[in-house]
């Protein structure tokens, strides 16, 4: 009788579809992820099953708490789609599909500097390029650890460019750039490049 009641409940909104989610939607290969399958009904003992395409990944029982499935994303096909099933006795409902976006992390970018020196000014062009990592890549340029450019988005494997003009400085300036893509909390920096102060003929990056 209980099975009949549960099935009847499922025909109403008392037993809606479960929800499948993850705190991390953008991942890199080799990353561990947790997937949460939850249900609005907190009083029923629910059996949760997780599927990817047409393979079964695991089953857990839960009441009131979401089922947590821990996975490692090591191959491209593991991006999904995933779905979970909530089952009570002989009745079940499925979540909507969930897929991860797999992104290759950016490698440390290379910063190149070109300078045109005049009597009073330095016209500086900064180039920054990360040769590996999923596009688009956002580049930001720094001078003495302070951002001097907005984020420059590159959708191709071309260097980001930033121009600035400075009065001939009296002290050294240190430049570096940051490369970052959709991977959260994952940014890489170039080696710093130091621009010496204007004393005599000390402008190694200058175009004569």
């Amino acid at each position: 009788r209980k099975a009949v009641l549960d099935c009847e409940a499922m025909k109403t909104n008392e037993f809606p579809s479960p929800c499948l989610d993850s705190k991390t939607k953008v991942v890199m290969k080799g990353q561990n992820v947790s997937m949460f399958c939850s249900h609005k009904n907190k009083s029923l003992q629910i059996t949760y099953s997780l599927f990817r395409r047409k393979t079964h990944l695991g089953t857990q029982d839960g009441k009131g708490e979401p089922a947590i499935f821990n996975l490692s994303i090591t191959e491209a096909h593991e991006s999904g789609p995933y779905k979970c099933k909530a089952q009570v006795t002989s009745c079940s409902k499925y979540s909507r599909d969930f897929s991860f976006t797999i992104v290759d992390p950016v490698t440390s970018p290379v910063l190149n500097i070109m300078v045109i020196q005049t009597e009073t000014d330095r016209h500086i062009t900064l180039h920054c390029l990360s040769v590996n990592g999923s596009l688009p890549i956002n580049y930001t340029f720094f001078e003495n650890h302070v951002a001097i450019s907005p984020a420059i988005s590159k959708y191709d494997r071309e260097p980001a460019e930033f121009n600035l003009t400075k009065k001939n400085p009296g002290e050294e300036e240190e430049y570096r750039c940051e490369a970052k893509n959709r991977l959260p909390n994952y940014a890489t920096y170039s080696h710093p490049v130091t621009m010496p102060s204007t004393g005599g003929d000390s402008c190694p990056f200058c175009l004569k």
Epitope: S49, F51, K54, T55, L57, E75, H77
Partner: antibody
Framework: EVQLVESGGGLVQPGGSLRLSCAAS????????ITWVRQAPGKCLEWIGT???????YYSTWAKGRFTISRDNSKNTVYLQMNSLRAEDTAVYYC?????????????WGQGTLVTVSS | AIQMTQSPSSLSARVGDRVTITCQSS????????LSWYQQKPGKAPKLLIY???RLASGVPSRFSGSGSGTQFTLTISSLQPEDFATYYC????????????FGQGTKVEIK
């Protein structure tokens, strides 16, 4: 070349045990699912059980308890342990590989190994 | 237990004939389309023809097609060729009582 090779079949007495091997080459068992299927002489195909890329195992109702599927990743080999064998277990036993993330779309098959249960 | 009923169990046909084989499941397959079709010739291992109920496996001639959803599925050979005389099986995947698979009992296609 992607292939599966079964071995370990032969004549066994009723009540006896046998372990079949399925050696995989050209791909990794940590990505693909392997399924065991059998076919009695002149009869239809019968699903025995499956081991997926995560090592989870699934069995048909009649095979549960008597048959056990395992794998050795270092040898890239899957095993079918068969206990308490009966005359009706006489069949050609196949192992087959599924598509990635599709356990039962069996696109690569071994040649089969014959198991005869008789006294 | 899940029953996968194939019909007919055998049929006789001529080269060039259109042949239809059906598979009726006692329960819906997973995702409504977790069904594949196989061809088997005597003494040989089965060969995958159709997956996802209607998608043609690699290298399979386009005269083979599949259709259906849920519990009812069909394999059609539009114009039977000499090499098509064989036994055909459906295979369904289920998640209703555990993760489970079941073959149909087969359809033998013979020369008339």
């Amino acid at each position: 070349e992607v292939q599966l090779v079964e071995s370990g079949g032969g004549l066994v007495q009723p009540g006896g045990s046998l372990r079949l091997s399925c050696a995989a080459s050209g791909f990794s068992l940590t990505i693909y699912t392997i399924t065991w299927v059998r076919q009695a002489p002149g009869k239809c195909l019968e699903w025995i059980g499956t081991i997926n890329s995560y090592g989870n195992t699934y069995y048909s109702t009649w095979a549960k308890g008597r048959f056990t599927i395992s794998r050795d990743n270092s040898k890239n080999t899957v095993y079918l342990q068969m206990n308490s064998l009966r005359a009706e277990d006489t069949a050609v036993y196949y192992c087959a590989r599924g598509y990635v993330d599709s356990d039962w779309y069996l696109n690569i098959w071994g040649q089969g190994t014959l198991v005869t249960v008789s006294s | 237990a899940i029953q996968m009923t194939q019909s007919p169990s055998s049929l006789s046909a001529r080269v060039g004939d259109r042949v239809t084989i059906t598979c009726q499941s006692s329960e819906s397959v997973y995702d409504n389309n977790y069904l594949s079709w196989y061809q088997q010739k005597p003494g040989k291992a089965p060969k995958l023809l159709i997956y996802d109920a209607s998608r043609l496996a690699s290298g399979v001639p386009s005269r083979f097609s599949g259709s259906g959803s849920g519990t009812q599925f069909t394999l059609t050979i539009s114009s039977l060729q000499p090499e098509d005389f064989a036994t055909y099986y459906c295979l369904g995947g289920y998640d209703s009582s555990g993760w489970y698979a079941a073959f149909g009992q087969g359809t033998k296609v013979e020369i008339k």
